[in-house]
C-alpha cells in the first residue's frame, strides 16, 4: 500500500488582522485509522489549535465536514486573526490507539498577519526655542506587520529631509514599531506652521495615516521694542510710547522705569494679532514736562514668556517752548498724576 502523506499545499499564508485564515491540509490515504490534529509550532511547546475528537476551539472550524465518510480534506478556518496567531501551523496525522500515536506531519504553513499601524503620534520639544534654532519632533506608530513601512515628514506641505527613522525589532516579529525624529529649523513665520508625520503601509491601501504637531507649541518669537515720544494737546504733557512688536506667545510683562526706578508694571492684555500669528502691543505714559529734571531717562522693560528681560530706553526731550510754559514754582512727579498711567492700543 502507498505510504500516507500529509499535504499542506501552501508554504505561507498572509492575512490582515481581524480577517479569517484558511489553512489547507489533505491526506493521501484513509489508512491507518486515526485523527488529524492541528498545531501551531512543533516540539514540546507546540499549541493544539484544533482536535476534532475533543476540546473547545471557538475560533476554528473545519472547511468540510470531517465526520463524513472518505473525507481526506482536513483544512481549517481560523476567524478573527490577531498578530499573536502568527507562526507555523502543522497538520498532523495520528494513528488510533490508547493514546493516539503521532504518525506524520505536514510540512507546515507559515501564517503571517498583516496588521495596521496605529495612528502616528507626533511629540515636540518640551521647551520653546527661538527662530534660527533647530527643534526635534518625534513620530511613533506601533503594532504593524509586515515590517516594510514608509514614513515621511512635511512642514506646511513641503517634504523634510533631515530625519532619522528606526523600525523595531530588527529581526522577524509578530508586529513592529516605528520611531522617527525630524529636525526642523524655526523661522519667525512659523507660529502658524505645522509638521506632519505620514505613515504608509500595505494594510492602508494607499491611504496613509497622519499625525500632526503645531510649531506654535515649540516656538518663541522674542519681541522687538521701540520707544518714542509725541507731544499732547496740553503743552506741558508728552506721550511716551513703548511699541512691542512681533512676539509669540502672548505672555508678556512690561515695566516702566524712571531713571532706573520702577514706576509701573502691567501685563499685556488687548493684543493685536499679526497675519503671521505673532502679536503687537503698546503701552504709553503721559509725562508732565514741567516736572522734569534734567536728563530723565524712561526705560521700557519687557519680560517675555519667562525669559530674561529686554529693554529700550528713551531720554525725555523737552523743548524750550515747553519749558517756557511752566511756572517757576511747578514741581511734582514727572509722570502726570491725573493722567492714566498706561494704556494699550
Amino acid at each position: 500500500e502507498e505510504e500516507l502523506q500529509v499535504i499542506q499545499p501552501e508554504k505561507s499564508v498572509s492575512v490582515t488582522a481581524g480577517e479569517s485564515a484558511t489553512l489547507n491540509c489533505t491526506v493521501t490515504s484513509l489508512i491507518p485509522v486515526g485523527p488529524i490534529q492541528w498545531f501551531r509550532g512543533a516540539g514540546p511547546g507546540r499549541e493544539l489549535i484544533y482536535n476534532l475528537k475533543e476540546g473547545h476551539f471557538p475560533r476554528v472550524t473545519t472547511v468540510l465536514d470531517p465526520t463524513k465518510r472518505n473525507n481526506m480534506d482536513f483544512s481549517i478556518h481560523i476567524s478573527n486573526i490577531t498578530p499573536a496567531d502568527a507562526g507555523t501551523y502543522y497538520c498532523v496525522k495520528f494513528r488510533k490507539g490508547s493514546p493516539d500515536v503521532e504518525l506524520k506531519s505536514g510540512a507546515g504553513t507559515e501564517l503571517s498577519v498583516r496588521a495596521k499601524p496605529s495612528a502616528p503620534v507626533v511629540s515636540g520639544p518640551t521647551a520653546r526655542a527661538t527662530p534660527e534654532h533647530t527643534v526635534s519632533f518625534t513620530c511613533e506608530s506601533h503594532g504593524f506587520s509586515p515590517r516594510d513601512i514608509t514614513l515621511k515628514w512635511f512642514k506646511n506641505g513641503n517634504e523634510l529631509s533631515d530625519f532619522q527613522t528606526n523600525v523595531d525589532p530588527a529581526g522577524k516579529s509578530v508586529s513592529y514599531s516605528i520611531r522617527s525624529t525630524a529636525r526642523v529649523v524655526l523661522t519667525r513665520r512659523d507660529v502658524h506652521s505645522q509638521v506632519i508625520c505620514e505613515v504608509a503601509h500595505v494594510t492602508l491601501q494607499g491611504d496613509p495615516l497622519r499625525g500632526t504637531a503645531n510649531l506654535s507649541e515649540a516656538i518663541r518669537v522674542p519681541p522687538t521694542l521701540e520707544v518714542f515720544q509725541r507731544p499732547m494737546r496740553a503743552e506741558n504733557q508728552v506721550n511716551v510710547t513703548c511699541q512691542v512688536r512681533k512676539f509669540y506667545p502672548q505672555r508678556l510683562l512690561l515695566t516702566w522705569l524712571e531713571n532706573g526706578n520702577v514706576s509701573q508694571t502691567e501685563t499685556a492684555s488687548t493684543l493685536t494679532e499679526n497675519k503671521d500669528g505673532t502679536y503687537n502691543w503698546r503701552s504709553w505714559l503721559l509725562v508732565n514736562t514741567c516736572a522734569h529734571r534734567d536728563g530723565v531717562v524712561l526705560t521700557c522693560q519687557v519680560e517675555h514668556d519667562g525669559q530674561p528681560a529686554v529693554s529700550k530706553s528713551h531720554a525725555l526731550e523737552v523743548s524750550a517752548h515747553q519749558k517756557e510754559q511752566c511756572s517757576d514754582t511747578t514741581s511734582g512727579p514727572v509722570l502726570a498724576p491725573t493722567a492714566p498711567l498706561g494704556g494699550s492700543g
Epitope: 507546540r46 507562526g87 503521532e102
Partner: antibody, heavy 122, light 112 residues
Framework: QVQLQESGPGLVRPSETLSLTCTVS????????WSWIRQPPGKGLEWMGF???????FYNPSLKSRVTISLDMSMNQFSLKMTSVTAADTAVYYC????????????????WGQGTTVTVSS | DIVMTQSPLSLPVTPGEPASISCKSS???????????LDWYLQRPGQSPQLLIY???NRASGVPDRFSGSGSGTDFTLKISRVEAEDVGVFYC?????????FGGGTKVEIK
C-alpha cells in the same frame, strides 16, 4: 544572519541571584525555542531549560526550583534567573536557539551565543 | 531522564584518515513519526558548540559532507570520512526527543 549575545555580571556572590540576558539580532523569536546551556570549567554541557515563542517554559528538573526563563518579544530578548547560587554554578553560560520542524522532538540547536563566564565567589 | 553515553572518551586521529564516534541512549530516540531526535555537536577549543547533525542523519547548513550521522533507536554513530586539522575539539551527542535535553559526556578528538 541570526546572532545571540549574552550579557550580565561575571561575578555573583554565593546565595545571590544570577541574572543573564540574551539579545537576539537579525532574526525572529517566532517559531523557535530559546535555550540556556552551561558548561562548568573543564566539563561537559548541561541543558538548563528553554522557552518557546508562546511563553511555555521547560526546565531541567535538577535546577527547576532555582531557574526562571522569561521572554521579551518586544525587545527580542530572553533572560535567565537562577537563585541561591553556589560555587558549583560557576560556568560558561550559553544562550542558544533550538529549531522545531516536526513532531514533539527538536531539530537542532543551530545558533549559539559566544558564552559568558560567570564566577560564583565571595 | 534519558542518559547518553559516548565512546571513546578520547580519540587520537591522523589527518586524512576516517574516524568514528559512538553514542548510545538509555531509551529509543525514534519517535512515532519516524524521526530519530539525536543531534551531534562539535566544540572547538575556546569556541561555542556548533551543530553538525540533527535527526540522527541530517547535516546542518554549511557542514562539510565529510561528516555523516547514522543509527536509529538507541545506537548512533558519527563518522568523519577524512579528518582535517580543524576537526579537533570535543564532539557531543544530544537527545532532543524529550525534556530535559541531555548530552553525552563528550569525545575529545586530537591529532596524533
Amino acid at each position: 544572519q541570526v546572532q545571540l549575545q549574552e550579557s550580565g555580571p561575571g561575578l555573583v556572590r554565593p546565595s545571590e541571584t544570577l541574572s543573564l540576558t540574551c539579545t537576539v539580532s537579525g532574526g525572529s523569536i517566532r517559531n523557535y525555542y530559546w535555550s540556556w546551556i552551561r558548561q562548568p570549567p573543564g566539563k561537559g554541557l548541561e541543558w538548563m531549560g528553554f522557552i518557546y515563542d508562546n511563553g511555555r517554559t521547560f526546565y531541567n528538573p535538577s535546577l527547576k526550583s532555582r531557574v526562571t526563563i522569561s521572554l521579551d518579544m518586544s525587545m527580542n530578548q530572553f533572560s535567565l534567573k537562577m537563585t541561591s547560587v553556589t560555587a558549583a554554578d560557576t560556568a560558561v553560560y550559553y544562550c542558544a536557539r533550538v529549531r522545531a520542524y516536526s513532531g514533539i522532538g527538536l531539530d537542532g540547536t543551530d545558533v549559539w551565543g559566544q558564552g559568558t563566564t560567570v564566577t560564583v565567589s565571595s | 531522564d534519558i542518559v547518553m553515553t559516548q565512546s571513546p572518551l578520547s580519540l587520537p586521529v591522523t589527518p586524512g584518515e576516517p574516524a568514528s564516534i559512538s553514542c548510545k541512549s538509555s531509551q529509543s530516540l525514534l519517535y512515532s513519526n519516524g524521526y530519530a531526535y539525536l543531534d551531534w555537536y562539535l566544540q572547538r577549543p575556546g569556541q561555542s558548540p556548533q551543530l553538525l547533525i540533527y535527526q540522527g542523519s541530517n547535516r546542518a547548513s554549511g557542514v562539510p559532507d565529510r561528516f555523516s550521522g547514522s543509527g536509529s533507536g538507541t545506537d548512533f554513530t558519527l563518522k568523519i570520512s577524512r579528518v582535517e586539522a580543524e576537526d579537533v575539539g570535543v564532539f557531543y551527542c544530544m537527545q532532543a526527543l524529550q525534556t530535559p535535553l541531555t548530552f553525552g559526556g563528550g569525545t575529545k578528538v586530537e591529532i596524533k
